[in-house]
Interface confidence: low
Amino acid sequence: AAEEDEEFTNITDIKPPLQKPTHSFCAMKVDDGPCRAYIKRFFFNILTHQCEEFIYGGCEGNENRFESLEECKEKCARDYPKMTTKLTFQKGKPDFCFLEEDPGICRGYITRYFYNNQSKQCERFKYGGCLGNLNNFESLEECKNTCENPTSDFQVDDHRTQLNTVNNTLINQPTKAPRRWAFHGPSWCLPPADRGLCQANEIRFFYNAIIGKCRPFKYSGCGGNENNFTSKKACITACKKGFIPKSIKGGLIKTKRKKKKQPVKITYVETFVKKT
């Protein structure tokens, strides 16, 4: 215990990752609007931290829409330097175990686990689905193995960054390696559940792209978005098959998507999520 305390003397100075976007609209889900045009635009994908192309209908929508890839990167992606360096760290608790729980700024509302340095145990907390920090685990076991009873060296491929507490420069910040999967599936499986505007309480299912599972939600009966299925089976059929291991090579699955008041267009997404 004394060694552990000595090793982490600057724990209270740890700053959270440089991850909150400069503009709140960068966290908005892509919205192509209700109109019928077919205009190429770019949006910032909060899940992948990358600017991606989408087809804009020509009216309404939201501020997460840019005419060029460069403009999108300038406004939203510059806070996310991409690093893919292979990293290792030695036996003992990684620094991020001592960060406070951080729900992030999104509204995905997911039960996750974090290491509570006060109680010295892993506990549940509510995660919004994006951003936050690395003290965030899908399972209690993963949290315990990483922060309560860490074993020997971990080796990870990770693109996340952390502020160096000594000179405030960006450094690579490792995390215990989850299994990384690529989601190659229809774009309507990505947005968070949207209750809509009416008063009903119908049980529907939405695909939670952060955890890779279909979860129930209460639908108001009107409005909302296309991530809305009448049965768990329908949700799984539409979205779950989009999961393939990142190591498997192959083309993206292109899914035809029919949109109201608009010609059929082909959209696909590629994002990386954790899967247990």
Epitope: P103, L140, A193, R215
Partner: antibody
């Protein structure tokens, strides 16, 4: 119909251990967390901990982490709570409850067992 | 731990009148616009029964005379008009973080 059926009244000696059960029916047992709550006579409700029957992940209140052990047997759709080193303070009604999760509405207890009464006496 | 303080500890309300029960949390129980505060009713010899979830949403089958409101740290349960069968103890409960905690309870008596 969703039901949580708990085992009957238990009388135990100080220092002993007891194991109570909570049998779920009417829904997919592995989909929802099962929580355990303590209520002493004429008093409030205290959260003990919860278990995810799907993978046996368990989480405990700091106060009960050395007192209670939560387990689940999916083939029997039954959750168990074992209480050890019993004292008079453990005399209470213990409830199991199902945690439900719906989108943004939060998670809460929508169904409860009828309770198991534990009396610790020498 | 998040401490939930309920007030009053007990109250007596005439039939047909309004009962108001307050629950104050020691820190915010709201996240991303969801208020993780829930209300239960408990009658002697019975387990608690869910009335209101997410601060203001009425559980299926619960009469519309029950309503909930509030956000962050201050929440209220209203019963109007009060009926005989509403005599019970009412608990608030938060689920924002472990350990989940309950208020001390409010005993409602019908005059």
């Amino acid at each position: 119909e969703v039901q949580l059926q708990q085992s009957g009244t238990v009388l135990a000696r100080p220092g002993a251990s007891v194991k109570m059960s909570c049998k779920a029916s009417g829904y997919s047992f592995t989909t929802y967390w099962i929580h355990w709550v303590k209520q002493r006579p004429g008093q409030g409700l205290e959260w003990i901990g919860a278990i995810d029957p799907g993978n046996s992940d368990a989480t405990y209140s700091q106060k009960f982490k050395d007192k209670a052990k939560l387990t689940a047997v999916t083939s029997a759709s039954t959750a168990f709570m074992e209480l050890n080193s019993l004292t008079n303070d453990d005399s209470a009604v213990y409830y199991c409850s199902r945690e439900v999760y719906y989108g943004y509405d939060g998670d809460y207890f929508d169904y409860w067992g009828q309770g198991t009464t534990l009396t610790v006496s020498s | 731990d998040i401490v939930l303080t309920q007030s009053p500890a007990s109250l007596a309300v005439s039939l047909g009148q309004r009962a108001t029960i307050s629950c104050r949390a020691s820190e915010s129980v709201s996240v991303h616009g969801t208020h993780l505060m829930h209300w239960y009713q408990q009658k002697p010899g019975q387990p608690p029964k869910l009335l209101i979830y997410a601060a203001s949403k009425l559980e299926s089958g619960v009469p519309a005379r029950f309503s909930g409101s509030g956000s962050e740290t201050d929440f209220t349960l209203n019963i109007h008009p009060v009926e005989e069968e509403d005599a019970a103890t009412y608990f608030c409960q938060q689920s924002i973080g472990d350990p989940w905690t309950f208020g001390g309870g409010t005993k409602l008596e019908i005059k």
